[in-house]
Every structure is written in C-alpha cells, then in structure tokens.
C-alpha cells in the first residue's frame, strides 16, 4: 500500500497557487482532466478540461485555469487571487464520469491566510506567462500560450473519491496514481 501524503502550500490572500499534475499519457492523453476540492466524502469538481484536449489551450473557470499538455502527460493548474475560504484539500483527477474519477497525485493542502502578500496584486492575478519550449524525448509542443477562454460550467459536480487524505490505497499500477510533475 502507498499513502497519499499531502503536500502543503501556504499563501496569503491575493496570491496564486500553481501546481503541475502528471498523468500516464498513453492512457489519459485524450481524457478530460479536472481539479477538485475535497469536501468530505464527496469532492467537488471545480473545473475540467474539454474533450478532446488541446495542447496548451487554457480553460478558465473563474479564478482557476487548467492547461493540458497531452503530448507530455502534464496538467498545469493555476488558482489566482486566493481567498481564505479557498483553504482545503485539492486533487487533480482524470474526469471520466461524474461518479468515476481517477486521482492523479497526492492531495495539495492549501492554506490561505489573511495579511499582506508583499506582492502587487497585478502581478499575482496575471495568468499570462511566457513558457520555455520543452527539450525532451517526447514530441515538442505547438504554440506556447494563447489567451484563456472562459468556460461556463454547471455547478460543481460530485465524484467518488479514489482515496481520502491519509488513507491507504492499493496500487496495481503506480503510474495510474502519480505524484511527479515530470511526464510518464
């Protein structure tokens, strides 16, 4: 068994969380990915990518931006203008059905506190960035970054959790539930 330990990020209000979630590209390149918040036993999907996934085409839902790189098996998640009420446990999942999601990596424990971030809000709230072109054995990506499109989605959906924080799960193939931000 493997314990899905939490990785903690501490921020002040107004700052930005950015994480990268790896997935087995041969299995999930064309699947929808989602970012969910753990709320009891029924986590809520906050944002999900469209199908089929397009390389580096951001999907924005409110303050959350998802960028999928299916050629590399990488989902980047960005939450801007963090608020105290955003505190909690989050996970990247492969979204296959509202009642069936595959957790990609260990939960992120986000702790947001009040107080000055010491950083101008304008730079924190920006979602634009210039990313390097990857130098890798995998295929190179296409255009680096386009303006995020806002996607109107239904209210958050519930999914069955693969594992609750701190619990242990049996892994038949550890690449299905993955922690690393580099590509499998």
């Amino acid at each position: 068994t493997t314990e899905l330990t939490e990785e903690k990020y501490e921020y002040k209000e107004g700052q930005t969380l950015e994480v990268k979630c790896d997935y087995a590209l041969e299995k999930y390149a064309n699947s929808r990915k989602a970012w969910q918040k753990m709320e009891g036993k029924m986590p809520k999907i906050l944002a999900k990518t469209e199908r089929p996934s397009e390389n580096s085409h951001p999907v924005q839902v409110g303050r959350i931006t998802l960028e999928d790189y299916p050629d590399h098996g990488l989902l980047q998640v960005r939450m801007t203008n963090l608020q105290v009420e955003d505190s909690g446990l989050y996970q990247c999942v492969i979204y296959q059905h509202p009642k069936e999601s595959h957790v990609l990596f260990n939960p992120i424990c986000l702790v947001v506190t009040k107080g000055s971030s010491g950083t101008p809000g304008s730079s924190e709230n920006s979602t634009q960035n210039v990313y390097r072109t990857p130098s890798t054995t995998a295929k190179a990506l296409g255009p680096r970054y386009t303006s995020p499109r806002t996607v109107t989605q239904a209210p958050p959906e519930s999914t069955v959790v693969v594992s609750t924080p701190g619990s242990e799960i049996n892994l038949t193939n550890v690449t299905d539930i993955i922690r690393v931000p580099v590509f499998n």
Epitope: E10, F105, Y131, R132, P181, V182, F183
Partner: antibody, heavy 119, light 108 residues
C-alpha cells in the same frame, strides 16, 4: 525517511566514460521523477538531467546532451547516469535528487559523489 | 533559458540580526521559486518552495516572499547554524531548471 545515496565517482581522463548510480529508499520510487544536479568545485549548482517516474521521458542540460544518459531501474530503486566523452568541465560533485510531488523542485538530496576529469 | 540573479554575492551579518537575500528572474516565473541552503561539504537542503512555503522541518525564522521576477528570502534572526550559501531555483515549466549563483551569508 527518504534517503538517496550516490556512488561511482572517481578520477578519469578526458574522453573516458563513467557511470554514476543512486540508490533510493523511504518513498515509492517509481512514483517520482529523479534528477542529477552537479556542482563544480567552488561553484554553484547546475541541473544536469531528469527522468520521469516510469523512465519514459528524459531531459538533459545542453552542456551534457548527447554525452550523458539518465536511466532508472524501478525494480531496484536505482537511478543511473552514464557519462561518456567526459571533459574537464564535467568535473564536479554530482548529486542525486528526488523531484517534489507537485512542481519541479528538489526536496531530497544525496550527499554527492565527486567526478574528476583530468589528464 | 531563464537567468536567476542573486544579490548580494556575500552578506556579512551578526548573529541575531536579520538577513535579506534577493533573487531576480530574467522573466516572470509567477511563484515557481525554491530556496536551498548549503553548508560546506554538505548537500543542499530545501528551505522554501512555491516562493512562500517552508519545507518540512524548516524553522519559522526563514520566510520567502515575492512573485513574478523579484523574490526575497528573509532570515529574521540569524543563528550560528544559518551561516551558509543560499541558492534560488526557478521551476516555471520546462527545463532547463536554473539556479542562481548563490549568496554567501557569513559572520560579521
């Protein structure tokens, strides 16, 4: 407790080869990317190479591309760095480092192994 | 390639005083920055990641701030064990992942 331990360093002549190894314990090895980072004597840190948890994707710094090969054996919890066509500029302490779970930083490091390339 | 510039190269501080180390990125890296401490003859140790979050076991006298291109590591009250070299590292997305040249914090 997470532990990584490097071995295989030594003195070689320019143009020769050397293979570094790293043994890891205390975490699910095949669920994390691993990297090599080096430090020339009296200098700063330089990222060298990274391999994904499954070993299917590798990355190299331009300075070693085509000469170094990173690989891993998940059944043995080992990471290797095959270094060919070594140059004096490759002289450094080579660290094996575990990549963190949600971003590309290094949360656990070995103590390093010294590679000296000199004629 | 993103260039990370650390300043000053050497910082002389008395024990108990505050130390402020700077790191500048050549382009925006949002909060994708880590700080490491390295003592002579030892491996680097992760201090801060995500620009602000202390790694497990790191005392709260260490704090990180900044975003975009300008970052700061502050040691509120220097202890004898804090005299070392400190490196910043960016991890915005694709390699190469680059380090700054380091700041040596020495006893004044």
């Amino acid at each position: 407790e997470v532990q990584v331990l490097e071995s295989g360093g030594g003195l070689v002549q320019p143009g020769e080869s050397l293979r570094l190894s790293c043994t890891a314990s205390g975490f699910t090895f095949n669920a994390y990317a691993m990297s090599w980072v080096r430090q020339a004597p009296g200098k700063g840190l330089e990222w060298v190479s990274t391999i994904s948890g499954s070993g299917s994707t590798t990355y190299y710094a331009d300075s070693v591309k085509g000469r170094f090969t990173i690989s891993r054996d998940n059944s043995k919890n080992t990471l290797d760095l095959q270094m060919n066509s070594l140059r004096a500029a490759d002289t450094a302490v080579y660290y094996c480092a575990k990549v963190a779970g949600s971003n590309f930083f290094f949360d656990h490091w070995g103590q390093g192994t010294l590679v000296t390339v000199s004629s | 390639e993103i260039v990370m510039t650390q300043s000053p190269a050497t910082l002389s501080v008395s024990p108990g005083e505050r130390a402020t180390l700077s790191c500048r990125a050549s382009q925006s890296i949002n909060s994708n920055l880590a700080w490491y401490q390295q003592k002579p003859g030892q491996a680097p140790r992760l201090l801060i990641y995500g620009a602000y979050t202390r790694a497990t076991g790191i005392p709260d006298r260490f704090s990180g701030s900044g975003s975009g291109t300008e970052f700061t590591l502050t040691i509120s009250s220097l202890q004898s064990e804090d005299f070392a070299v400190y490196y910043c590292q960016e991890f915005i997305m694709w390699p190469p992942w680059t380090f700054g040249l380091g700041t040596q914090v020495e006893i004044k």
